[in-house]
């Protein structure tokens, strides 16, 4: 029978015929930077080619002995995970391995460094086709690490990275808290996060999604037909790798933009339990479980957007969060949000010739996040447009005047410390979906998108008495772009995206005494791209 | 992540001193800042990457470790460069002592340095 | 469905050797670790020991220096050897696998999930 | 080698009641403990693994808890199909170690 992590990770589709095609990932070469490896167990003989590069520190101990089967134990599991006969993932992939971690798993930044940049010389030397780097090993935070990841990943190298098994945020250790970087978490066959003894799976907005770490039969360095169970989540971004080298076989001219999407899109959503992770990363944790596309081949039609969680600002009074998308990402909206309530809102600016999203503490506020929705949007022509405070009653709107300019998300910015409670009288007037409508004491910012076939609706969801959560999803076929709240009042902590939902959040209604007239709606922006649709069908 | 290193726990120190004479004051208005891991037993003192500005040639390297080992000896400081770094990354692997970190700090192309760390198997 | 069975003489004469095989069915033996247990009339459960199919071996202190388990992998078998028994071995023996796995943090660990399938116990009587 | 001691050896309840056994271990082995109930003739069989992880098909009234030193098996509601012996065993180190066993019988 298919061990249950190789069933968690395969489409329905698949399982009543056979697990996968037999060559997946054969276009593919997985660089493994870990421990020796035992390349002649049954599993991994001849897909694993062992590389001369060994930069590892000595054993811990006088007394330690090195022996094969303990040196080799590590990455002979993580290569059969990825590539094994019987239970890899991507079984027609390629491997070459790096020795950066010695017989007693542990290893150096400085070594590993090494290791990377060898992997970009011999990809300058003797270029092929896609690869993907596994680095299944974490250390403390290092901006030297995450650099050379971000080098790598910009000459257009997949890195994927365990998140840490240290049951901490994934951000406080590298390589998983490096942005280019495809950070993975670890759940069992429960999809519950894994946890055994003290540790137990990272989380956080540096983890982009999970996928099975717990009790994974692969091959063991015991012998050469031996197996063994190993958990962790080394063991959840080898998955995370073949399924990678999958798409990658199946669609080599993927980016690393369009791959993390397409990760995102086709995995499990929200099954993951998150009473599991503290209260205050709940919110910025995925609950994505990755999983292999329903077919090899085609999901270019669609817009692929995810949702991007700044660091936390900091409590000081003008302190800022800023999110950001990746190089070949279209930042489309921006909203923000704070547990204590007390924001300035947020609003879209360009850095360095590209948009970011930046969220604005408010006095006595205990910080505050950018949320950034970012999405792959060929051939885009975005621009923020803003208005000031109206001071009207009417409350403030900006539109999109362009020609073809949709909106694709609204933003609110506002100077004073309190808004007071505001209900425009009428959200959207008919015939004017591309305006944005806030407060009349609050600047408002609409992103104003041009792009083949692009269309976009808005979509609201009021409910008359305060609620402590509200929510609004674009229908099948359509994806969020933006999702904002109206009133920006103050007891609204504040909206951002989780997958193709809109969640607005406003503070326990029992403790503000809130009344009718602050009723909040979540509005979404849903978007589809005509062109996308036409130039797949016309490729089918 | 970001530009938010300063947002974790690793310890930032920009060290501006007078100028040492022997060196050449990096760039007006910038100071190379020096880093090192969060977790104490994960540190490893006496390595550290020097990392230098973006567009800094392996010939440019390569005399920027020379010098540092030039101007440690002067001090009486062993140093060995263990690794020239480029292709990813403009710099070099030093070992050395930490008194020299200051020193180091101040030559030109020096971005940061950061003390080397320990990785696990995970 | 994984399934155990014991097999061996029911009966073992005083300072001879106690042997028994344990037979695995719809699983492979070549990834989890199995054990024998003994449990004497009326009373509580004794660990013996595991052995790993890689022939790794582990056993009970109380017991070491009269005890080995073996491996036969084409079998699917493993077996228990106890010399110089004496009536207090008399036992119902059991074999049972122990599912562990390992995760590192800055060490390796190893962690069991117990032993989640037994098999359905023999009785030796150590007897003249 | 780690002791487990367990209480009570012997319980009299009814069906319906609830249920709890406690298990001792001698040193912290953190939540590294299983649960095994056996009935008269039969092999043991898996309830819990680490303190309160409930065994695959294990119904739902039985709940395990503790860590450290001290662990305690809770059936909610007792059914006729429980009467039987309860044992612990540490999974922290070899050799594996058992308590002696609670047996509980029908009032």
């Known amino acids: 029978s298919i061990p249950w992590n190789l069933e968690r990770i395969t489409p329905p589709r698949y399982r009543a015929d056979e697990y996968q095609p037999p060559d997946g990932g054969s276009l593919v070469e997985v660089y493994l930077l870990d421990t020796s490896i035992q390349s002649d167990h049954r599993e991994i003989e001849g897909r694993v080619m062992v590389t001369d590069f060994e930069n590892v520190p000595e054993e811990d101990g006088t007394r330690f002995h090195r022996q094969a089967s303990k040196c080799d134990s590590h990455g002979t599991h993580l290569a059969g995970v990825v590539s094994g006969r019987d239970a890899g993932v991507a079984k027609g992939a390629s491997m070459r391995s790096l020795r950066v971690l010695n017989c007693q798993g542990k290893g150096t930044v400085s070594g590993t460094l090494i290791g990377l940049e060898f992997i970009r010389k011999s990809q300058l030397v003797q270029p092929v086709g896609p690869l993907v780097v596994l680095l299944p090993l974490a250390g403390g935070y290092s901006r030297v690490l995450n650099a050379a990841c971000q080098r790598l990943a910009r000459a257009g190298v997949v890195l994927v990275t365990a998140a840490g098994n240290f049951r901490d945020d994934a951000c406080l250790y590298s390589p998983a808290s490096a942005p280019e970087v495809i950070t993975v978490g670890a759940t069992n066959a429960q999809d519950q996060p894994v946890t055994l003894g003290t540790l137990g799976t990272n989380f956080g907005r540096c983890v982009d999604l999970f996928a099975p770490g717990e009790d994974i039969i692969g091959a063991s360095s015991d012998c050469s037909t031996c197996f063994v169970s190993q958990s962790g989540t080394s063991q959840a971004a080898a998955h995370v790798a073949g399924i990678a080298a999958m798409m990658l076989s199946a669609e080599p001219e993927l980016t690393l933009a369009e791959l993390r999407q397409r990760l995102i899109h086709f995995s499990a959503k929200d099954v993951i339990n998150e009473a599991w992770f503290p209260e205050d990363q709940r919110v910025l944790t995925p609950n994505l479980v990755a999983a292999l596309p329903p077919s090899t081949h085609g999901a270019g039609w669609q817009l692929f957007c995810r949702t991007v969680w700044s660091a936390h600002s900091g409590p000081t009074r003008m302190a800022t969060a800023i999110a950001r998308c990746a190089p070949d990402e279209e930042l489309l909206s921006c909203s923000s949000f704070s547990r204590s309530g007390k924001r300035r809102g947020e609003r879209m600016e360009a850095q360095g010739g590209k948009l970011v999203c930046r969220a604005h503490n408010a006095f006595g506020g205990e910080g505050v996040y950018a949320i950034a929705r970012c999405c792959l949007l060929p051939q885009a022509n975005c621009s923020v447009h803003t208005a000031p405070p109206a001071e009207a009653s009417m409350g403030t709107r900006v539109h999109c005047h362009q020609q073809g300019h949709v909106l694709t998300g609204c933003s609110s910015h506002w100077e004073v410390e309190d808004l007071g409670t505001h209900k425009p009288p009428v959200l959207r007037p008919r015939g004017q979906p591309n305006q944005c409508v806030g407060h009349r004491e609050a600047s408002i910012h609409a992103s104003c998108c041009h792009a083949p076939g692009l269309e976009c609706k808005v979509k609201e969801h009021g409910i008359p008495a305060p609620q402590e959560q509200v929510t609004v999803a674009c229908e099948e076929g359509w994806t969020l772009t933006g999702c904002s709240a109206l009133p920006g009042t103050s007891h609204v902590l504040g909206a951002y995206a989780v997958d193709n939902t809109c969640v607005v959040r406003s503070r326990d209604v029992s403790t503000t005494g809130s009344t009718s007239e602050e009723a909040v709606t979540a509005v979404a922006i849903c978007c589809r791209s005509r062109h996308l649709a036409q130039a797949s069908q016309e490729l089918q | 992540q970001e530009d938010e290193d300063g947002d974790y726990e690793e310890l930032v120190l920009a060290l501006r001193s007078e100028e040492d004479g022997l060196a050449e004051a990096p760039e007006h208005g910038t100071t190379a800042t020096f880093h090192r891991c969060a977790k104490d037993p994960w540190r490893l003192p006496g390595t550290y990457v020097v990392v230098l500005k973006e567009e800094t040639h392996l010939s440019q390297s390569e005399r920027t470790a020379r010098r540092l080992q030039a101007q440690a000896a002067r001090r009486g400081y062993l140093t060995k460069i263990l690794h020239v770094f480029h292709g990813l990354l403009p710099g070099f692997l030093v070992k050395m002592s930490g008194d020299l970190l200051e020193l180091a700090l101040k030559l030109p192309h020096v971005d940061y340095i950061e003390e080397d760390s320990s990785v696990f198997a995970q | 469905q994984v399934q155990l069975q014991e097999s061996g003489p029911g009966l073992v004469k005083p300072s001879e050797t106690l042997s028994l095989t344990c037979t695995v069915s719809?699983?492979?033996?070549?990834?989890?670790?199995w054990s024998w247990f003994r449990q004497p009339p009326g009373k509580g459960l004794e660990w013996i020991g595991y052995?790993?199919?890689?022939?790794?071996?582990n056993y009970n202190p109380s017991l070491k220096s009269r005890v080995t388990i073996s491996i036969d992998t084409p079998r699917n078998q493993f077996s228990l050897k106890l010399i110089s028994v004496t009536a207090a071995d008399t036992a119902v023996y059991y074999c049972?696998?122990?599912?562990?796995?390992?995760?590192?943090?800055?060490?390796?660990?190893?962690?069991?999930?117990?032993?989640?399938?037994w098999g359905q116990g023999t009785t030796v009587t150590v007897s003249s | 080698d780690i002791q487990m001691t367990q209480s009570p050896s012997f319980l009299s309840a009814s069906v319906g009641d609830r249920v709890t056994i406690t298990c001792w271990a001698s040193q912290d082995i953190s939540s590294y403990l299983a649960w095994y109930q056996q009935k008269p003739g039969i092999a043991p069989k898996l309830l819990i693994y680490?303190?309160?992880t409930l065994q695959s098909g294990v119904p739902s009234r039985f709940g395990g808890s503790g860590s450290g030193t001290e662990f305690t098996l809770t059936i909610s509601s007792l059914q006729p199909e429980d009467f039987a012996t309860y044992y612990c065993?540490?999974?922290?180190?070899?050799?594996?170690?058992f308590g002696q066993g609670t047996k509980v019988e029908i009032k």
């Open positions: 680490a303190a309160s």
């Open positions: 065993q540490q999974l922290n180190s070899y050799p594996r170690t």
């Open positions: 052995i790993y199919y890689s022939g790794t071996t």
């Open positions: 719809g699983d492979s033996i070549n990834t989890y670790y």
């Open positions: 049972a696998r122990e599912r562990i796995t390992m995760i590192r943090g800055v060490t390796l660990y190893y962690y069991s999930y117990g032993m989640d399938v």
